[in-house]
Protein backbone atom coordinates (compact mmCIF):
# COMPACT_ATOMS: atom_id res chain seq x y z
CA UNK A 1 0.00 0.00 0.00
CA UNK A 2 1.05 3.58 -0.58
CA UNK A 3 2.62 5.22 2.44
CA UNK A 4 0.27 7.58 4.32
CA UNK A 5 0.80 11.22 3.55
CA UNK A 6 2.35 10.68 0.13
CA UNK A 7 0.78 12.20 -2.96
CA UNK A 8 -1.34 9.83 -5.04
CA UNK A 9 0.15 8.67 -8.30
CA UNK A 10 -0.65 10.71 -11.38
CA UNK A 11 -3.02 9.47 -14.05
CA UNK A 12 -1.54 6.58 -16.00
CA UNK A 13 0.67 5.47 -13.13
CA UNK A 14 0.24 3.27 -10.10
CA UNK A 15 1.98 2.77 -6.77
CA UNK A 16 4.60 0.01 -6.47
CA UNK A 17 5.37 -1.23 -2.98
CA UNK A 18 8.16 -3.33 -4.47
CA UNK A 19 9.88 -0.21 -5.82
CA UNK A 20 8.48 2.32 -3.31
CA UNK A 21 7.44 4.73 -6.04
CA UNK A 22 4.79 5.43 -8.63
CA UNK A 23 5.29 3.52 -11.85
CA UNK A 24 4.10 4.27 -15.36
CA UNK A 25 1.40 1.78 -16.27
CA UNK A 26 3.02 1.43 -19.70
CA UNK A 27 5.74 -0.56 -17.92
CA UNK A 28 3.26 -3.38 -17.44
CA UNK A 29 3.95 -4.23 -21.07
CA UNK A 30 7.46 -5.32 -20.06
CA UNK A 31 6.45 -7.20 -16.92
CA UNK A 32 2.70 -7.71 -16.55
CA UNK A 33 2.98 -9.33 -13.13
CA UNK A 34 4.65 -6.33 -11.49
CA UNK A 35 2.83 -5.39 -8.31
CA UNK A 36 1.71 -1.97 -9.58
CA UNK A 37 -0.01 -3.49 -12.62
CA UNK A 38 -2.97 -4.51 -10.48
CA UNK A 39 -3.55 -0.83 -9.79
CA UNK A 40 -3.29 -0.07 -13.47
CA UNK A 41 -5.87 -2.71 -14.37
CA UNK A 42 -8.24 -1.44 -11.70
CA UNK A 43 -7.88 2.22 -12.68
CA UNK A 44 -10.95 3.67 -14.39
CA UNK A 45 -10.54 4.78 -17.98
CA UNK A 46 -9.71 8.40 -18.69
CA UNK A 47 -12.82 10.61 -18.49
CA UNK A 48 -14.49 11.55 -21.75
CA UNK A 49 -16.69 14.48 -22.69
CA UNK A 50 -20.35 13.73 -23.18
CA UNK A 51 -21.64 14.48 -26.66
CA UNK A 52 -24.93 15.79 -25.30
CA UNK A 53 -25.80 18.26 -22.55
Amino acid sequence: EQAPGTAPCSRGSSWSADLDKCMDCASCRARPHSDFCLGCAAAPPAPFRLLWP
Epitope: D18, L19, D20, A26, R29, A30, R31, P32, H33
Partner: antibody
Protein backbone atom coordinates in the same frame (compact mmCIF):
# COMPACT_ATOMS: atom_id res chain seq x y z
CA UNK B 1 27.78 -0.22 -19.72
CA UNK B 2 25.78 -2.57 -17.53
CA UNK B 3 27.90 -5.16 -15.72
CA UNK B 4 27.23 -7.76 -13.05
CA UNK B 5 30.39 -9.07 -11.42
CA UNK B 6 29.94 -12.21 -9.35
CA UNK B 7 32.17 -13.51 -6.60
CA UNK B 8 34.63 -16.35 -7.15
CA UNK B 9 34.23 -20.12 -6.85
CA UNK B 10 33.36 -21.65 -3.50
CA UNK B 11 34.26 -25.04 -2.06
CA UNK B 12 32.29 -25.76 1.10
CA UNK B 13 31.48 -28.73 3.29
CA UNK B 14 28.04 -30.35 3.55
CA UNK B 15 25.85 -28.72 6.19
CA UNK B 16 27.60 -25.38 5.93
CA UNK B 17 26.33 -22.11 4.48
CA UNK B 18 27.73 -19.88 1.76
CA UNK B 19 27.11 -16.28 0.74
CA UNK B 20 27.89 -15.18 -2.80
CA UNK B 21 27.77 -11.70 -4.25
CA UNK B 22 26.79 -9.89 -7.43
CA UNK B 23 28.17 -6.36 -7.81
CA UNK B 24 26.27 -4.16 -10.25
CA UNK B 25 27.64 -1.22 -12.21
CA UNK B 26 26.64 0.94 -15.14
CA UNK B 27 23.08 1.64 -14.04
CA UNK B 28 20.98 2.75 -11.07
CA UNK B 29 21.05 -0.33 -8.85
CA UNK B 30 17.74 0.35 -7.10
CA UNK B 31 15.77 0.70 -10.35
CA UNK B 32 15.96 -2.92 -11.48
CA UNK B 33 15.34 -6.40 -10.14
CA UNK B 34 18.18 -8.82 -9.45
CA UNK B 35 17.21 -12.45 -10.04
CA UNK B 36 19.22 -15.55 -9.15
CA UNK B 37 19.29 -18.66 -11.32
CA UNK B 38 20.77 -22.10 -10.64
CA UNK B 39 22.38 -24.35 -13.23
CA UNK B 40 23.68 -27.78 -12.35
CA UNK B 41 26.38 -29.22 -14.59
CA UNK B 42 24.89 -30.16 -17.94
CA UNK B 43 21.43 -29.16 -16.79
CA UNK B 44 18.95 -26.37 -17.46
CA UNK B 45 18.20 -23.06 -15.78
CA UNK B 46 16.20 -22.83 -12.58
CA UNK B 47 14.89 -19.58 -11.08
CA UNK B 48 15.64 -19.29 -7.37
CA UNK B 49 14.12 -15.92 -6.62
CA UNK B 50 14.58 -12.19 -7.05
CA UNK B 51 15.01 -9.03 -5.06
CA UNK B 52 14.10 -5.39 -5.49
CA UNK B 53 17.31 -3.77 -4.20
CA UNK B 54 15.69 -0.45 -3.34
CA UNK B 55 13.20 -1.91 -0.88
CA UNK B 56 14.66 -5.35 -0.18
CA UNK B 57 11.39 -6.99 -1.14
CA UNK B 58 11.90 -10.57 -2.29
CA UNK B 59 10.10 -13.29 -4.20
CA UNK B 60 11.21 -16.92 -4.00
CA UNK B 61 10.54 -20.12 -5.87
CA UNK B 62 8.76 -22.49 -3.48
CA UNK B 63 11.56 -24.99 -4.06
CA UNK B 64 14.19 -22.60 -2.69
CA UNK B 65 12.23 -21.01 0.13
CA UNK B 66 14.22 -21.72 3.29
CA UNK B 67 17.29 -22.69 1.26
CA UNK B 68 18.15 -19.30 -0.26
CA UNK B 69 18.11 -15.86 1.32
CA UNK B 70 18.42 -12.83 -0.94
CA UNK B 71 19.66 -9.45 0.29
CA UNK B 72 21.02 -6.28 -1.25
CA UNK B 73 23.30 -3.49 -0.08
CA UNK B 74 22.44 -0.19 -1.76
CA UNK B 75 25.62 1.50 -0.55
CA UNK B 76 27.83 -0.91 -2.47
CA UNK B 77 25.45 -1.75 -5.35
CA UNK B 78 25.77 -5.41 -4.42
CA UNK B 79 23.21 -8.21 -4.24
CA UNK B 80 23.85 -11.30 -2.15
CA UNK B 81 22.52 -14.82 -2.00
CA UNK B 82 23.06 -17.02 1.02
CA UNK B 83 22.48 -20.76 0.71
CA UNK B 84 22.14 -22.79 3.89
CA UNK B 85 22.33 -26.45 4.97
CA UNK B 86 24.29 -27.30 1.86
CA UNK B 87 24.26 -30.75 0.28
CA UNK B 88 25.71 -32.17 -2.92
CA UNK B 89 22.58 -31.21 -4.87
CA UNK B 90 23.44 -27.56 -4.23
CA UNK B 91 26.64 -27.95 -6.25
CA UNK B 92 26.00 -25.81 -9.32
CA UNK B 93 26.76 -22.57 -11.10
CA UNK B 94 24.67 -19.69 -9.77
CA UNK B 95 23.94 -16.69 -11.97
CA UNK B 96 22.61 -13.30 -11.04
CA UNK B 97 20.67 -11.43 -13.69
CA UNK B 98 19.29 -7.93 -13.96
CA UNK B 99 15.66 -8.01 -15.04
CA UNK B 100 13.86 -5.03 -16.44
CA UNK B 101 10.68 -3.50 -15.09
CA UNK B 102 10.28 -0.74 -17.63
CA UNK B 103 8.35 -0.41 -20.87
CA UNK B 104 11.45 0.49 -22.90
CA UNK B 105 12.53 -3.15 -22.71
CA UNK B 106 16.30 -3.33 -22.86
CA UNK B 107 16.91 -6.98 -22.21
CA UNK B 108 18.42 -8.95 -19.38
CA UNK B 109 22.02 -8.75 -18.24
CA UNK B 110 23.69 -11.74 -16.61
CA UNK B 111 26.69 -12.14 -14.36
CA UNK B 112 29.43 -14.61 -15.27
CA UNK B 113 28.29 -17.11 -12.64
CA UNK B 114 29.65 -18.39 -9.34
CA UNK B 115 30.58 -22.07 -9.14
CA UNK B 116 29.64 -23.73 -5.86
CA UNK B 117 31.05 -27.14 -5.00
CA UNK B 118 29.75 -28.92 -1.91
CA UNK B 119 32.10 -31.68 -0.88
CA UNK B 120 33.57 -33.14 2.27
CA UNK C 1 3.73 -23.06 -12.50
CA UNK C 2 4.05 -22.73 -16.25
CA UNK C 3 5.96 -25.67 -17.71
CA UNK C 4 8.13 -24.95 -20.75
CA UNK C 5 8.95 -28.00 -22.88
CA UNK C 6 11.74 -28.37 -25.43
CA UNK C 7 13.42 -31.24 -27.24
CA UNK C 8 16.89 -31.87 -25.86
CA UNK C 9 18.57 -31.87 -29.28
CA UNK C 10 17.90 -30.29 -32.65
CA UNK C 11 18.43 -32.09 -35.90
CA UNK C 12 22.11 -31.61 -36.82
CA UNK C 13 22.45 -28.68 -39.21
CA UNK C 14 24.95 -27.74 -41.87
CA UNK C 15 26.62 -24.33 -41.71
CA UNK C 16 24.81 -21.84 -43.90
CA UNK C 17 21.49 -23.68 -43.80
CA UNK C 18 18.49 -22.90 -41.62
CA UNK C 19 17.60 -24.43 -38.27
CA UNK C 20 14.41 -24.46 -36.24
CA UNK C 21 14.01 -25.00 -32.51
CA UNK C 22 10.62 -25.58 -30.90
CA UNK C 23 9.15 -24.81 -27.50
CA UNK C 24 5.77 -25.43 -25.92
CA UNK C 25 4.22 -23.85 -22.83
CA UNK C 26 1.65 -25.47 -20.56
CA UNK C 27 -0.37 -22.26 -20.47
CA UNK C 28 -0.99 -19.59 -23.06
CA UNK C 29 1.62 -16.84 -22.87
CA UNK C 30 -0.63 -14.44 -24.75
CA UNK C 31 -1.66 -11.72 -22.30
CA UNK C 32 -4.89 -9.73 -22.55
CA UNK C 33 -2.72 -6.76 -23.58
CA UNK C 34 -1.91 -8.55 -26.84
CA UNK C 35 1.71 -9.33 -25.96
CA UNK C 36 3.04 -12.89 -25.91
CA UNK C 37 5.55 -13.24 -23.07
CA UNK C 38 7.88 -15.79 -24.65
CA UNK C 39 11.66 -15.29 -24.59
CA UNK C 40 14.60 -17.08 -26.17
CA UNK C 41 18.10 -17.29 -24.68
CA UNK C 42 21.29 -18.77 -26.04
CA UNK C 43 23.94 -20.17 -23.74
CA UNK C 44 27.19 -20.70 -25.56
CA UNK C 45 29.66 -23.21 -24.09
CA UNK C 46 31.21 -21.87 -20.89
CA UNK C 47 29.23 -18.63 -20.99
CA UNK C 48 26.21 -17.04 -19.33
CA UNK C 49 22.86 -17.09 -21.11
CA UNK C 50 22.22 -14.18 -23.46
CA UNK C 51 18.84 -12.84 -24.52
CA UNK C 52 18.02 -13.34 -28.19
CA UNK C 53 14.29 -12.66 -28.49
CA UNK C 54 11.81 -10.97 -26.17
CA UNK C 55 8.02 -10.92 -26.27
CA UNK C 56 8.00 -13.74 -28.81
CA UNK C 57 9.20 -11.85 -31.87
CA UNK C 58 11.38 -8.89 -30.88
CA UNK C 59 15.11 -9.12 -31.51
CA UNK C 60 17.24 -8.15 -28.52
CA UNK C 61 19.90 -5.49 -28.99
CA UNK C 62 22.93 -6.70 -30.94
CA UNK C 63 21.32 -9.94 -32.09
CA UNK C 64 21.72 -10.57 -35.84
CA UNK C 65 18.57 -10.64 -37.92
CA UNK C 66 19.33 -14.23 -38.91
CA UNK C 67 17.32 -15.03 -35.79
CA UNK C 68 13.54 -14.83 -35.81
CA UNK C 69 10.73 -16.24 -33.72
CA UNK C 70 7.05 -16.90 -34.17
CA UNK C 71 4.27 -18.86 -32.57
CA UNK C 72 0.84 -19.01 -31.06
CA UNK C 73 -0.03 -18.73 -27.39
CA UNK C 74 1.52 -22.08 -26.51
CA UNK C 75 3.66 -23.28 -29.43
CA UNK C 76 6.74 -21.39 -30.52
CA UNK C 77 9.56 -21.72 -33.02
CA UNK C 78 12.96 -20.05 -33.12
CA UNK C 79 14.43 -19.95 -36.61
CA UNK C 80 18.05 -19.33 -37.57
CA UNK C 81 18.15 -18.55 -41.27
CA UNK C 82 21.85 -19.12 -41.98
CA UNK C 83 23.55 -21.02 -39.21
CA UNK C 84 27.07 -19.91 -38.30
CA UNK C 85 29.62 -21.69 -36.11
CA UNK C 86 29.10 -19.10 -33.38
CA UNK C 87 25.44 -20.14 -33.07
CA UNK C 88 26.36 -23.43 -31.42
CA UNK C 89 25.12 -23.78 -27.88
CA UNK C 90 21.97 -24.49 -25.90
CA UNK C 91 18.81 -22.54 -26.69
CA UNK C 92 16.35 -21.98 -23.86
CA UNK C 93 12.83 -20.69 -24.08
CA UNK C 94 11.34 -18.96 -21.06
CA UNK C 95 8.27 -16.96 -20.14
CA UNK C 96 7.76 -13.69 -18.31
CA UNK C 97 4.02 -13.89 -17.82
CA UNK C 98 4.07 -14.48 -14.07
CA UNK C 99 6.20 -15.81 -11.25
CA UNK C 100 7.87 -18.23 -11.01
CA UNK C 101 10.12 -17.50 -13.99
CA UNK C 102 10.52 -20.86 -15.72
CA UNK C 103 12.72 -22.09 -18.54
CA UNK C 104 12.54 -24.94 -20.97
CA UNK C 105 15.08 -27.71 -20.53
CA UNK C 106 17.12 -26.35 -23.42
CA UNK C 107 17.77 -27.53 -26.97
CA UNK C 108 21.34 -28.15 -28.03
CA UNK C 109 22.12 -26.97 -31.54
CA UNK C 110 24.54 -29.36 -33.19
CA UNK C 111 26.36 -29.09 -36.47
CA UNK C 112 26.69 -31.86 -39.03
Amino acid sequence: QVQLQQSGPELVKPGASVKMSCKASGYTFTDFIIAWVKQRTGQGLEWIGEIYPGTGRTYYSEKFRGKATLTADKSSNTAYMQLSSLTSVDSAVYFCARRTIYYDYDGDYWGQGTTLTVSS
Amino acid sequence: DIVMTQAAFSNPVTLGTSASISCRSSKSLLHSNGITYLYWYLQKPGQSPQLLIYQMSNLASGVPDRFSSSGSGTDFTLRISRVEAEDVGVYYCAHNLELPWTFGGGTKLELK
